[in-house]
Amino acid sequence: AVNGTSRFTCFYNSRANISCVWSQDGALQDTSCQVHAWPDRRRWNQTCELLPVSQASWACNLILGTPDSQKLTAVDIVTLRVMCREGVRWRMMAIQDFKPFENLRLMAPISLQVVHVETHRCNISWKISQASHYFERHLEFEARTLSPGHTWEEAPLMTLKQKQEWICLETLTPDTQYEFQVRVKPLQGEFTTWSPWSQPLAFRTKPAALGKD
């Protein structure tokens, strides 16, 4: 939602967290700003304090409940407002009618581990975190492997078009250090975006056996 010269973007993690970023052109004086969440069909409302992440943008997380509680559904609409203090009053800076399941960004996958490693191959698994049971199997993943001498940006993306929480990396070089990351995205939602990348998992392929190719 854009109001005046500000931009207000929020994502739902599918369970009990709405993360918001508000950016404002032109520096604001030292003032206290909050995001207020008012669902249309729930008894609760929630507030979080916006904290600076850069000179002209602020972020906060609306914690709606325990991490794995299902606090919103696809029929919910949450009115989100940015409110800033001026004098003793609050002034509304931005507003949006937020449809949580149209604006999804899941938590980064967790518990990455090497299941089996060989000279040229490595089997890796992971788990998704705080993802709604509503998705059933309607998730996709992207993965990337960091090779020596390259950057993450140069790493080719591997796409898994189904809910598959493992991957078998092939054509690796023996006795070489690699890093691996994965991210997840629900298929649902017009403005849904990829989760952050997982923490990198470091692994090393086995050395080639002596006297063999």
């Epitope: 109001n3 404002q24 032109g26 604001l28 409110m83 009053r89 609050w90 002034r91 800076m93 931005a94």
Partner: antibody, heavy 121, light 112 residues
């Protein structure tokens, strides 16, 4: 019906202090802000600052900082404005006015009848 | 602070005729949220001020439709389409966009 009833006229000597009261009725006192505005004789209006009775938070116009104190007593739905170190140019009518806690539309919708403060030696 | 300058200082009008009051701000009073918090207050003789117009052009409840507000940026106008006897008094513009909030010096409307 919303009403703001202010205390009566005051005559003060230079250097003294004056405390004006503003009793609210017809609405929930702690849900709205009370602003104070003054009008020197034959002059325009000057916004002095305001208090939010819900938590007692205040904001003062820099022009009056150090001399003005705004307080409230929620048990009797009354706001107070005290001005110290009075000088002749503080002779004015002092108004309290109600304002919304969230400034969505306007600053002040209902006003008190005003309190005349005369500073004279 | 934002200085609000009103003109004319005094406005003699004939009953039933239109009247127009100008208010100019020393800087743009569009708030960073995109709204312009320009208000008009009427003060009849011996009375307290009364809110007429908010956010440039919105009439407050109970205000007759002969009062209208317009303008943007730094230039604003209050119009009375047909002046009635009860419209006599001083009219103040007010900006609530930049703290400290400030009033104009006032325009006195009187009957010719």
């Amino acid at each position: 019906e919303v009403q703001l009833v202010q205390s009566g006229a005051e005559v003060k000597k230079p250097g003294a202090s004056v405390k004006v009261s503003c009793k609210a009725s017809g609405y929930t006192f702690t849900d709205y802000v009370i602003s104070w505005v003054r009008q020197a004789t034959g002059q325009g209006l000057e916004w002095m600052g305001e208090i939010y009775p819900g938590d007692g938070n205040t904001y003062y116009n820099e022009m009056f900082k150090g001399r003005v104190t705004m307080t409230r007593d929620t048990s009797i739905s009354t706001a107070y404005m005290e001005l110290s170190s009075l000088r002749s140019e503080d002779t004015a009518v002092y108004y309290c006015a109600r304002g919304s806690y969230t400034y969505d539309n306007y600053a002040m919708d209902f006003w008190g009848q005003g309190t005349t403060v005369t500073v004279s030696s | 602070d934002v200085v609000m300058t009103q003109s004319p200082l005094s406005l003699p009008v004939t009953l039933g005729q239109p009247a127009s009051i100008s208010c100019r701000s020393s800087q743009n009073i569009v708030h960073s949220n995109g709204n312009t918090y320009l208000e008009w207050y009427q003060q009849r003789p011996g009375q307290s001020p009364r809110l007429l117009i908010y956010k440039v052009s919105n009439r407050f409840s109970g205000v007759p439709d002969r009062f209208s507000g317009s303008g943007s940026g730094t230039d604003f106008t209050l119009k009375i389409s047909r002046v009635e006897a009860e419209d006599v008094g001083v009219y103040y513009c007010f900006q609530g966009s930049h703290i400290p909030w400030t009033f104009g010096g006032g325009t006195k409307v009187e009957i010719k």
